[in-house]
């Protein structure tokens, strides 16, 4: 039985050209996290593997940085980055947990800074 829960930053917004941290946290389980995948729709952004460390997809290398922790930092944001992001925790022996974050990249200079993981 899966007992864990994933907390995420939820719905967040950021300015075009700026940066944002996508963060998920798995709690209430003793399961071993074997790998975390970060995906956007049907694109793999990055993998953090317990044995092999971080791997950023070649197509995102210039704009994605690993961390902090198991989170992911998106840089040089464009309006095309608006959309759903998923943190996928592969664990043993629980199985797979998924968290969802919706990012809105705003054209205006006054983006809402409500998220607790936001980079100023």
């Amino acid at each position: 039985m899966m007992t864990g829960t994933i907390e995420t930053t939820g719905n967040i917004s950021a300015e075009k050209g700026g940066s944002i941290i996508l963060q998920c946290h798995l709690s209430s389980t003793t399961a071993q996290v074997t790998q975390v995948n970060w995906e956007q729709q049907d694109q793999l952004l990055a993998i953090c593997n317990a044995d092999l460390g971080w791997h950023i997809s070649p197509s995102f290398k210039d704009r994605v940085a690993p961390g902090p922790g198991l989170g992911l930092t998106l840089q040089s944001l464009t309006v095309n980055d608006t959309g759903e992001y998923f943190c996928i925790y592969h664990t043993y022996p629980d199985g797979t947990y998924t968290g969802r974050i919706f990012l809105e990249v705003l054209e205006s200079s006054v983006a809402e800074h409500g998220a607790r993981f936001q980079i100023p």
């Epitope: 039985m1 899966m2 074997t34 790998q35 995948n37 049907d42 694109q43 793999l44 993998i47 593997n49 044995d51 092999l52 791997h55 997809s57 998923f86 996928i88 592969h90 043993y92 022996p93 629980d94 199985g95 797979t96 947990y97 998924t98």
Partner: antibody
Framework: QVQLLESGGGLVQPGGSMKLSCVVS????????MNWVRQSPEKGLEWVAE??????????HYAESVKGRFAISRDDSKSSVYLQMNNLRAEDTGVYYC???????????WGQGTTLTVSS | DIQMTQSPASLSASVGETVTITCRAS??????LAWYQQKQGKSPQLLVY???TLAEGVPSRFSGSGSGTQFSLKITSLQPEDFGSYYC?????????FGGGTKLEMK
């Protein structure tokens, strides 16, 4: 212990359809991504399709060779995964295995396989 | 898609010998590589994952090594139960690729 049991194989004519089933026991099925892998003397082992969890909106992915012809689905209440195969070709002949994804990248449990023969 | 090429396609060895099977990837696999063993008439079994980590219950005479594009599976002091076929497998993004296999036969 973990068990995966495939069924539904048999002889079918080119252009025909067939539905494979796999029922699992020994682990919480609804927590794991499931895959179908096939094997033939000509092509060896070949990944066919993957289905994710309810929390992933049951997202599916397919090998190029079966896209548009095969459909993977699951019923968590029955601990079962299915493969609906349409417009079958001679090259689809082989042993079809139901597998559980482990560590985000690998297959730790396999069924005993069910044989599909596409021939006139 | 990344292509996985295994060599040799087949080899003969005796009980007690040491054998090495290699797997070459057409692109960098970042060590996301597994090895499986398959005995005649049975389904494959996971032996090694992440290039060098032994799966649960796998004897220590099996060892995986390599990174990037070149990988190998070494079996020391071959036992009768080790004969069969071996496959490498890579996963990246939304696709899984297997090598063509190596058949290990008793000399």
């Amino acid at each position: 212990q973990v068990q995966l049991l495939e069924s539904g194989g048999g002889l079918v004519q080119p252009g025909g359809s067939m539905k494979l089933s796999c029922v699992v026991s020994g682990f919480t099925f609804s927590n794991y991504w499931m895959n179908w892998v096939r094997q033939s003397p000509e092509k060896g082992l070949e990944w066919v399709a993957e289905i994710r969890l309810k929390s992933n909106n049951y997202a599916t992915h397919y090998a190029e060779s079966v896209k548009g012809r095969f459909a993977i689905s699951r019923d968590d209440s029955k601990s079962s995964v299915y493969l609906q195969m349409n417009n079958l070709r001679a090259e689809d002949t082989g042993v079809y295995y139901c597998t559980r994804l482990y560590y985000g990248n690998y297959f730790d449990y396999w069924g005993q396989g069910t044989t599909l023969t596409v021939s006139s | 898609d990344i292509q996985m090429t295994q060599s040799p396609a087949s080899l003969s060895a005796s009980v007690g010998e040491t054998v090495t099977i290699t797997c070459r990837a057409s692109e960098n696999t970042y060590s996301y590589l597994a090895w499986y063993q398959q005995k005649q008439g049975k389904s494959p079994q996971l032996l090694v994952y992440n290039a060098k980590t032994l799966a649960e219950g796998v004897p220590s005479r099996f060892s995986g090594s390599g990174s990037g594009t070149q990988f190998s599976l070494k079996i020391t002091s071959l036992q009768p139960e080790d004969f069969g076929s071996y496959y490498c497998q890579h996963h990246y993004a939304f696709s899984y690729t297997f090598g063509g296999g190596t058949k290990l036969e008793m000399k």
